[in-house]
Amino acid sequence: FSPLRRISIKILVHSLFSMLIMCTILTNCIFMTMNNPPDWTKNVEYTFTGIYTFESLVKILARGFCVGEFTFLRDPWNWLDFVVIVFAYLTEFVNLGNVSALRTFRVLRALKTISVIPGLKTIVGALIQSVKKLSDVMILTVFCLSVFALIGLQLFMGNLKHKCFRNSLENNETLESIMNTLESEEDFRKYFYYLEGSKDALLCGFSTDSGQCPEGYTCVKIGRNPDYGYTSFDTFSWAFLALFRLMTQDYWENLYQQTLRAAGKTYMIFFVVVIFLGSFYLINLILAVVAMAYEEQNQ
C-alpha cells in the first residue's frame, strides 16, 4: 500500500472522521432550512461541498474507485455521495437553464445521514429488503383490488350520478336544456336537492332499499359524479381507486354511504367483504412482511 493509501485508510476508519461528516451533514441540513439565507452562506456552501469532496476522495484512495469487489462505487451508499457531489459542482460551475430545479437535488445531502448513522442504515436496509419481499404480496394485493374493482364496476357503474331533481320544470325545459345552461353552483342548487352544508346533490337510487328523494323531487341519472367527479365506479381505473381507498380506509365511510344510498343497502355485503379482506387481511400481510424483513436485517 502506498503511504497516501495508508493515510486514507487511517482517516477513514477513525471515529472522528465519521463525527466530522455527521456534524457537517446536520449543519448543512440546518442551513438548507433557511428561508432567505444571507450572502455569507454561499461560502459555507462551498465548505460543505469541500468536506464532501474530501470524504469521497479519502474513500476512493482507501478503497479504490470501481475496479475490485469493495471499491467506492460497489457500495450503493456511496452512489448517493457521488450524486451529491456531482450535483454540487453542476449547480455551481455549469451554467444550466433551470438551476432551481437542480438545486432540489441538494436535499439529497440530508440522505447522507443514513449512511453515517448505523441504526438508520439498518432500518433503510430493512425497508429495501422488504420492498423486494413485498413483490409477491403486492401482486396479490393488486390482483384482489382488480377483482373487486371489476365487481364494483359491474354493480355500481353510473350509480353515483343519480341525483334528486326538482319536479317543477318550465313548459319548454328539458333535462338536456337545463344541463346545458347550468354553470354556477347556485344554478345547480335551483334544480337539484342539496342537503345543508353539502357540496354535492343528494344521491338517490331506483331500487326499493336505496335512498329516496324528498317530496317534489325525482331521482334522475345526470351530471357528474360526487366529489368533483373523482368518486365513481364508472371505469376500471376509478373503481380501482375507490377500492384502494377502501383498503387504506381513507374516508371510506363516505364512499360506503354514497354507494349504499345510490345502489341499495343490500350492497353493504360488498363493502364488508372488501374491508375484511383488503383492509384487515392484506394490509396486515404487508405489515408482516415488512416486520419479517426488519427482523432478518437486524440478525
Epitope: G158, N167, L175, T218, V220, K221
Partner: nanobody
Framework: EVQLVESGGGVVQPGGSLRLSCAAS????????MAWYRQAPGKQRELVAY??????ISYADSVKGRFTISRDASKRVYLQMNSLRPEDTALYYC???????????????WGQGTLVTVSS
Amino acid sequence: EVQLVESGGGVVQPGGSLRLSCAASGPVFNINRMAWYRQAPGKQRELVAYVTPTGDISYADSVKGRFTISRDASKRVYLQMNSLRPEDTALYYCRALLQPDRYSNTRTYWGQGTLVTVSS
C-alpha cells in the same frame, strides 16, 4: 331507440270525457317522471300534469278537478279527462324522463302527440 306512443285522442263534445294513454316502447331501464303537455293552435306548449315514481302528482290550475293523471307498473301513463271544454282543444304530448339502460344518463323523451278536439 325508445319511443313514446300516445293514443286515445279524438273529437268529443263539451262536458264529455276522454282517456289518453302513453306507452314507452323499446328498451327502458327506468322511467322517472311522466307528464302530459298540450299545445293549442297558435299558443305555447304548456304542462297539463305530471306524475313521479314516488307518487308526486301536480296539475295545471286550468285542469284541476277535471283531469286525473295516473301511471301503472308497466311503462304507461294515463290522462283521464272529464268535463271537457272547447279551450281544452289541443295537441296533447306525452313526455318522460327515462333511462334507456343502466349505463345511459336520464334523458327527456317526447311523444308525437295526439289531437283532442272539443266541439259541439
